[in-house]
């Protein structure tokens, strides 16, 4: 699927990967944080509250119905209202030690300020990204991956660890985001919503997609996590949506097959090692790029972000199991374990390719709204 | 730097209890608070096993050998895991390592525990 005046790049193709330019230009909203299309009620960013991370509401889940299928991007624009009242998810909160207010979850109470104050800070993730707004970086090169593709054995620890899935990733899995800028890969998990709802973190012109990947990588100028936390450029995620395609994705079924072993929270299985490069995009040349932070508490900023354009394709039966099979704290399904859109607060996303110039008739000649910042690098 | 520490291993007769204590020591040690607590335990000879962990929301989960005999626990304001073991065999003979999962795994040193007569 492509938005209204995509650039006309052919699709590359290969491995897990869906449409070449998923992220288009779309009429802009007025307002830089207006409403965006299937974020949580009560998140909206109204003007005056740009500086509340607002993690009090989520959506509330609708009933379910069979492979009800996901949001089109020529659906686009549209701002859904709320679901239908239902009990929201994650809200039997499982609080053993009375008032702790470590024990997280999305939606309701502790809200996360008072879990970790860095919740609150001025340049947190997700946000929305809006291409006509990006600034095209050409400084910006290819992402490079190295050892990504894994031998059988060892095998991976695949835990559900209440929140998300998460595939621990063993030594060796080098990224670098360019000359000098290297990370080694941690560990990958997942983002997603319910039946017919949608559960990406990121969104794109207030488009949610229906999951994401996160791929964490720490930088080589650390040895571990706790001394990079909320140093600028310590962390880095290589993020991908995910979309509904009609065939079965099989880099994601190796994981997804194996998803009911670990139903329960806290249960862990273990896989074969996989080619984790396949659960990306192919192109790895054209990405938007930010600052932000980690996405659940502690929600340390300094993170670096980098966004494929490019999409990976899953079948709705996957994209069903993916977001029906889980449970978490309390009993309730592990579902739309997504945060918020959160506000730029004056942050330029940077865009490998010209993401914003507008080459459709209707233009008299390319608008590119904001400069890149390293461009002189 | 983050260090884990184990405590409370030792030589125990069959049916006997031990409470093992693992401790977060280090300038960011409030990181632990959001990770998955586990332990572990390798026998000799024998790949390392997982036997509980305890999630940052408190959810729970142990391995079918000692279901019902231990318990693994959180104290987040004093950054501990426990685990009590109770009914202990023999085949509980290992050394028990602590282990926190956030974004990467952290390792303890390990403790050793007998269960012999």
């Known amino acids: 699927q492509r938005l209204p005046r995509m650039q006309e790049d052919s699709p590359l193709g290969g491995g897990s990967s869906g449409e070449d330019d998923p992220l288009g230009e779309e009429d802009l909203p007025s307002e830089e944080d207006s409403p965006r299309e299937e974020d949580p009620p009560g998140e909206e960013d109204l003007p005056g509250e740009e500086d509340l991370p607002g993690e009090e509401d989520l959506p509330e889940v609708k009933p379910k119905s069979e492979e009800e299928g996901s949001l089109k991007l020529e659906d686009l624009p549209t701002v859904e209202a709320p679901g239908d009242p239902q009990e929201p998810q994650n809200n039997a909160h499982r609080d053993k030690e009375g008032d702790d207010q470590s024990h997280w979850r999305y939606g309701g109470d502790p809200p996360w300020p008072r879990v970790s104050p860095a919740c609150a800070g001025r340049f947190q993730s997700p946000v929305d990204i809006r291409p006509q707004l990006a600034a095209f970086c050409p400084a910006l090169r290819p992402l490079e991956l190295l050892g990504f593709q894994l031998p059988p054995l060892p095998e991976l620890r695949l835990r559900n660890n209440g929140h998300s899935v998460q595939l621990t990733l063993p030594p060796g899995l080098e990224m670098a985001l360019g000359p000098g800028r290297e990370y080694r890969a941690l560990q990958l998990h997942l983002h997603w919503g319910a039946a017919g709802r949608p559960g990406s973190e990121h969104t794109v012109e207030g488009h949610r997609f229906p999951a994401e990947i996160h791929v964490v990588h720490l930088s080589t100028a650390f040895a571990r996590v706790d001394e990079a936390l909320g140093r600028p450029g310590g962390l880095a995620v290589l993020a991908a949506f995910l979309e509904e395609g009609p065939e079965e994705n099989s880099a994601y079924e190796q994981l997804l097959s194996r998803l009911e072993e670990i139903a329960e929270e806290g249960s862990e299985t273990q896989v074969p090692g996989l080619d984790i490069s396949a659960l990306l995009p192919s192109d790895f040349s054209r990405y938007f790029q930010y600052e932000g932070s980690l996405t659940t508490p502690p929600c340390a900023q300094g993170v670096i972000w980098t966004v494929f354009n490019q999409t990976v394709m899953l079948s709705a039966k996957q994209l069903h199991t993916l977001s029906d099979t889980l449970w978490g704290p309390g009993d309730s399904r592990l579902q739309l374990n997504f945060r918020a859109t959160q506000p730029l607060n004056g942050r330029v996303i940077e865009a490998s390719f010209p993401a914003g110039v507008d080459s459709s008739p209707r233009a008299a000649e390319p608008v590119q709204l904001n400069s890149c910042l390293a461009a002189g690098d | 730097q983050v260090q884990l520490q184990e405590s409370g291993g030792g030589l125990v007769q069959p049916g006997g209890s031990l409470r093992l204590s693992c401790a977060a020591s280090?300038?960011?040690?409030?990181?632990?608070?959001?990770?998955?607590m586990a332990w572990y335990r390798q026998a000799p000879g024998k790949q390392r096993e997982l036997v509980a962990v305890?999630?940052?929301?408190?959810?729970?989960k142990y391995s079918d050998s000692v279901k019902g005999r231990f318990t693994i626990s959180r104290d987040n304001a004093k950054n501990t895991v426990l685990l009590q073991m109770n009914s202990l065999k023999p085949e509980d003979t290992a050394v028990y390592y602590c282990?926190?999962?956030?974004?990467?795994?952290?390792w303890g040193q390990g403790t050793q525990v007998t269960v012999s007569s």
């Open positions: 305890i999630t940052s929301a408190g959810g729970t």
């Open positions: 282990n926190a999962d956030y974004l990467q795994d952290y």
């Open positions: 280090g300038n960011s040690v409030n990181i632990f608070r959001f990770a998955a």
